[in-house]
Structure formats: C-alpha cells, structure tokens
C-alpha cells in the first residue's frame, strides 16, 4: 500500500549538538525499517547525511540528528524517504526552533532560617550561546495533595531557588522539578527534569506561641533576599508550541 505522512515533521534543536524531528504516519509503521530522513546543511561542500528514525508510538516516528554547534545562519534541507519515494521535503533552521536541554542534577538542601535551597545545573557549557539565556520554571507539588502545588519563575542568573519552608505544609512530602527556556530565541520549554523529593519538616508559627519568634530571613545575604523576591509565584499555565516546517 501507499505510504503517507499524516502530520509532517516538527523539528527542534538543543542548539548545541542535536536536532530532533518527529512526525506521524497515516498507519502503524516500522519507522527504522521503512523510512529514512536525509538532512544536509545548506552550505557549500556539505555532505548529505541520513538519520534512521525510531518508533515513539505505533505510527509516530522520531529522528535524532547530530549537528555541529549551531549558528543562526544554519539552514538544513530535510527529505523524508520511504525507499525511493519522497514523502516530504522541507527546511529547518535550528536557531528558529530551539528546545533547550533539560536542566540537570536537581537537589534540595536545608538552608539557614527555615528555607530550602533548590539547586540544579545549567545544561549548557559557558561558551554556548544559550548558557546565559536560560530562565527556569520550578514546579513544587505535594505528593499527597494534587491541589497543593506552586510554580516559580526563576528569571535571574543562577540555577537556584530559595523556598521558605513556611510556604509548604509541615510534615508533607514534596517533589520539585525544573525546566528551562530561552526567551531571546523564542524557544519552547525544555522537558522537565527528573523530580527530587523531600520531607518538609518545618514547624508552623502557631507552635511557637509564647516562644521568641525567629526571623526566617536572618543570616541571608542581600543576594538571597533578592532571589526570594525575584522567584515570583505565578499561575500554572503550560503552553505547547508546535512548529511545522514547509
């Protein structure tokens, strides 16, 4: 039977080493056996390269293409083949379709004066364009109460968030995860990092009645204060942007 593409390839680049294209066929397909995605940089002397797709679902194929450290001018010609049949042809400019790498190594540490310090790693080396462009979203949720979650925008430099323990329920188990985006590249959000879980052992203020009340901000330097004020709590909205390339 005839092979057809139902949803044409949608591609994103991590802007450092890899571009990923995903598409949907009109019926279940063995992607690696039946299809090939050829890609070639539009640059004098560039060779044609072939990507062998893998199945993400029965009829969904995904191809991961190694690319050189991307620059704004790079444009790739993409051709999707089923044997000798050209199913789709298009172009892809990595700088226009960035999906950052996932932040790594998310950890939670008890910090001075009843605060939790959340830390993670910037997924880009300092020499990469995206290293200094990333802002982050941190999602903190109660493992036993789906209604109890908070979302923080970390828009300052530095992959850290200080969280007052008093904003979380005492004795509850919480999980945090983080994702990144690059505003100047109009990127999509990265995938979420793996979650990290901890027990919020903070003692509510009511239990301190009659006792001296400690100042939860004592001992924090001005940077710490700025971090707390800048980690604004925001409403929970997720936007998914799908880019199609013709």
């Amino acid at each position: 039977g005839s092979v057809k593409v139902l949803h044409e390839p949608s591609c994103f680049s991590d802007y450092i080493s890899t571009s990923v294209c995903q598409w949907k066929m009109d019926h279940p397909t063995n992607c690696s056996a039946e299809l090939r995605l050829s890609y070639q940089l539009d640059f004098m002397g560039s060779e044609n390269h072939t990507c062998v797709p893998e199945n993400r679902e029965d009829s969904v194929c995904v191809c991961s293409m190694p690319i050189d450290d991307a620059v704004e001018a790079d444009v790739y010609q993409l051709d999707l083949w089923a044997g000798q049949q050209l199913l789709w042809s298009g172009s892809f400019q990595p700088s226009k379709h960035v999906k950052p790498r996932t932040p790594g190594n998310l950890t939670v540490h008890p910090n001075i004066s009843h605060t939790w310090l959340l830390m993670w790693t910037n997924p880009y080396p300092t020499e990469n364009h995206l290293h200094s462009e990333l802002t982050y979203m941190v999602n903190v949720s109660n493992d036993n109460d789906p209604e109890d979650f908070k979302v923080y925008n970390v828009t300052y430099m530095g992959p850290t968030l200080r969280l007052a323990a008093s904003t979380l329920k005492s004795g509850a188990s919480y999980s945090a995860r983080v994702r990144a985006w690059a505003q100047t590249y109009n990127s999509t959000w990265s995938d979420w990092s793996p979650s990290t879980t901890w027990l919020n052992y903070y003692e509510p203020w009511e239990q301190h009645l009659g006792k001296p009340i400690p100042n939860p901000l004592l001992g924090l330097d001005s940077t710490g204060l700025n971090d707390i004020f800048e980690a604004q709590k925001i409403e929970w909205h997720e936007h998914h942007h799908h880019h199609h390339h013709h």
Epitope: M44, G45, E47, V71
Partner: antibody, heavy 125, light 112 residues
Framework: EVQLVESGGDLVKPGGSLRLSCVAS????????MTWVRQAPGKGLQWVSL????????YYADAVKGRFTISRDNAKNTLYLQMNSLRAEDTAVYYC??????????????????WGQGTLVTVSS | DIVMTQTPLSLSVSPGETASISCRSS???????????LDWYLQKPGQSPQGLIY???KRLSGVPDRFSGSGSGTDFTLRISRVEANDTGVYYC?????????FGQGTKLEIK
C-alpha cells in the same frame, strides 16, 4: 608532506576533450573537498569546480557547466576533471587545490590550503 | 555571484615598510560571529598560488606573522609588515562562502 601532482594537460583542438588528473598524498583525501582553479595566460585566477569529500556534491562555474565534469576516486587518492567541447577561452594552467574538510556536518574551512604545480591546457586549431 | 574588488591593482613599497591591500565583496562574507569566508593568496612569479590567510584573519601554518588579515562583512585588508624582497608577487583575495567561488583581480606587489 601534503602534495598534489596534476597531469593530463595538452594541446587540443576546439571541440575536443581532455581529462586532467590530480594525485594527492600526505593527507586523508576522502575527508576533504577538492577544487580546480584555472589561470589564463597573463590573467588572474578563476575558480572552475568543487567536489565534496565523498563525491556526492559538485559545483561548477557557469563558464564550464555542462561541458566539464569533476569526479574523484578516493581509493586512488585521485581527482579528475573531464573537459569536453573545449573552447579557445579554456586555454589556461589548471591547478587542483585542497579545499574544506567535509566529513563534519558543517564543513571546516581552511581556504585552498594546498595547491598543485599546475598543468597547461591549450585549445587551438 | 559575489563580486570581489581589490585595491590597489599594483603597489610598490620599500623593504621594511608596510604594505596594505584592500578587498571588498558585493555581499557580506560573514556566516556567523568570527567566520568571514575570505582568504588571501600569494602567487610568486612562475609559481603556483599559496594560501596565506583564511576566514579573514587566520594564518595558515608556516605563514610568517608579518602577514595579517582583518575586516568583517564586506571590507577586508591584508597587511604585510616589514616587507621583504621575497614578498614580491600577485596577491589575490577569494570568497569561499558560496558557489561560484570568486577571486579579486589581484594586486601586484613590487619591492623597490
């Protein structure tokens, strides 16, 4: 030592054909694009053609398109230029040169970093 | 096609002086930051051309540091400091960004 040696230049009549060869040594031939450049007597340099490392991509100057064919045999470390329908204005010294590294996704560029000694093609009746 | 224009077409300098050759392209040769696809070549009398500078300012191995390239976009300069008798020849700029590759007309350098 990186070296290019051209051969095949000759006196040929207008409309005739000639095949130039360029034997390379001292570097990994298949990894690099190769270029032909010519120089008419007393004139400047003129680019003729380029071929990628695998031979999969070729480019030509308008003046030779459809008449000249660039090719390579990576097993023999040899570059070729097949010249057909030759004209008086094709008279020149033909140089081969090593061009960009094309085994990477974006070719790495070093200019035309090694040139051969040249071979003279004369088209005259 | 990208047109390459060199000035001057001939130049006469005394040994020890500095020679400057200009090359202008009809389109920008800047592909990305730091990557101007502009080369300089020297053809000595009776010899094949030899590479001097690539990507606008990078010297090829074995090229003396008396040779330096500068510029970006469409305007480039080759400077030869402390000129020697051995520097005599014709200097060409070339764009390597897109097909067809194109050369300047050449600048003949004569040592007084």
């Amino acid at each position: 030592e990186v070296q290019l040696v051209e051969s095949g230049g000759d006196l040929v009549k207008p409309g005739g054909s000639l095949r130039l060869s360029c034997v390379a040594s001292g570097f990994t031939f298949r990894d690099y694009a190769m270029t032909w450049v010519r120089q008419a007597p007393g004139k400047g340099l003129q680019w003729v053609s380029l071929i990628s490392g695998s031979g999969g991509k070729t480019y030509y100057a308008d003046a030779v398109k459809g008449r000249f064919t660039i090719s390579r045999d990576n097993a023999k470390n040899t570059l070729y230029l097949q010249m057909n329908s030759l004209r008086a204005e094709d008279t020149a010294v033909y140089y081969c040169a090593v061009d960009r590294l094309t085994k990477t996704i974006r070719p790495q560029y070093y200019g035309l970093w090694v040139w051969g000694q040249g071979t003279l093609v004369t088209v005259s009746s | 096609d990208i047109v390459m224009t060199q000035t001057p077409l001939s130049l006469s300098v005394s040994p020890g002086e500095t020679a400057s050759i200009s090359c202008r392209s009809s389109q920008s040769l800047l592909y990305s930051i730091g990557y101007n696809y502009l080369d300089w070549y020297l053809q000595k009398p009776g010899q094949s051309p030899q590479g001097l500078i690539y990507l606008g300012s990078k010297r090829l191995s074995g090229v003396p540091d008396r040779f330096s390239g500068s510029g970006s976009g469409t305007d480039f300069t080759l400077r030869i400091s402390r000129v020697e008798a051995n520097d005599t020849g014709v200097y060409y700029c070339m764009q390597g960004l897109q097909s067809p590759l194109t050369f300047g007309q050449g600048t003949k350098l004569e040592i007084k």
